[in-house]
């Protein structure tokens, strides 16, 4: 079995998580990609996905999550802005490749958000001034429906699939509470 590795990000409320997931560009450049959260004992849940086919660099925003897919560099950039303590958890980037199950991109991201004043949002460990001129808007894209025959009793392995419904959408005040991923990096 492939050993799953995690990269830990410790950030404060209000800051921005800014991570990059790289992929084999020749193989997956225009494939649809997604950002998922993994909870113990559950299947990964899709929080946001790129369009299909994925558009080069064009941002897709779902609430506080922004995806940007840079085809020429084989890179999916994921940003979660204005982080909240409840956003803490384990995340992963995946590539949708129907009819097969999603392909996970390493490494998984262990996000730890703590309370504490952060003058202005930054990313990674760094606090940097930014200016938000207008509230984030939501672009919509359709995330495909995946089901898996397996029952998951622990943090799922690489090949586990997402079970979000196509018309689902995120609770914009708490990205870890998935209610329904919108039709819309």
């Amino acid at each position: 079995a492939t050993k799953l590795t995690e990269e830990k990000y410790e950030l404060k409320e209000g800051q921005t998580l800014d991570v990059k997931c790289d992929y084999t560009l020749e193989k997956f450049a225009s494939s649809q990609k997604a950002w998922q959260i993994i909870r113990d004992g559950e299947m990964p849940k899709t929080l946001a996905c790129t369009e299909r086919p994925s558009k080069n660099s064009h941002p897709v925003q779902v609430g506080r999550i922004i995806l940007e897919d840079y085809h020429d560099h084989g890179l999916l950039r994921v940003r979660m802005v204005n982080l909240q303590v409840e956003d803490s958890g384990l995340y992963q980037c995946v590539i949708y490749q129907p009819p097969k199950e999603p392909h996970m991109l390493f490494d998984r991201i262990r996000l730890v958000v703590t309370k504490g004043f952060s003058g202005t949002p930054g990313s990674n460990e760094n606090s940097t001034q930014n200016v938000y001129k207008i509230p984030p808007t939501t672009t919509k894209a359709l995330c495909p429906l995946y089901t898996s025959p397996r029952t998951v009793t622990q943090a799922p392995p690489k090949s586990t699939a997402d079970v979000s419904t196509p018309d689902s959408e995120i609770n914009l005040t708490n990205v870890t509470d998935i209610i329904r991923v919108p039709v819309f990096n």
Partner: antibody, heavy 117, light 107 residues
Amino acid sequence: EVQLVESGGGLVQPGGSLRLSCAASGFTFSSYWMSWVRQAPGKGLEWVANIKQDGSEEYYVDSVKGRFTISRDNAKNSLYLQMNSLRAEDTAVYYCARDYGDAFDYWGQGTLVTVSS
Amino acid sequence: DIQMTQSPSSVSASVGDRVTITCRASQGIRKWLAWYQQKPGRAPKLLIYAASRLQSGVPSRFSGSGSGTDFTLTISSLRPEDFATYYCLQAHGFPWTFGQGTKVEIK
């Protein structure tokens, strides 16, 4: 072919203002973060500021915060840098660059800003 | 901010030589490092991104390696047009930061 062309540089006195422009062509300007990077004479490169695709977020290096403002006009495929309260240490060639996720992949030819009395 | 330290600051070499430039990050940046070439009076040109991926159109004599904190740019056989200043850029932690540059001069 991707092209970035800066303009607006020149000689200005300390405390003065200048507005730099960057005209972009050959790519979908509105889909990319854009940055200004500068290089003092005989020195290395320093990122100055960047702006999100729709202009809703701006970031600045500490040394220019409160003095410089980055903006863009996607309808005109143009990037701007408004520089106020200029100091001698702001003297540099200013480059407009396209952010490509993990690198600045295209750069303009640069425009020289000289702050001197 | 993440500091990037390049070495050496300058290197004298001859056409055909193998040249190696190193860049060290003050903290881990995974593979998010790019290399640039700059000639006098010109804008920087992207050579390598993601530590080892060659930018389109860049000759294969340029190669990059490394991850975490230590990275290397290698020019396998120096050509006359390669005499220039080379910079590394980390794109992991915001703000992105450059190394101070390495000048490759003619011996």
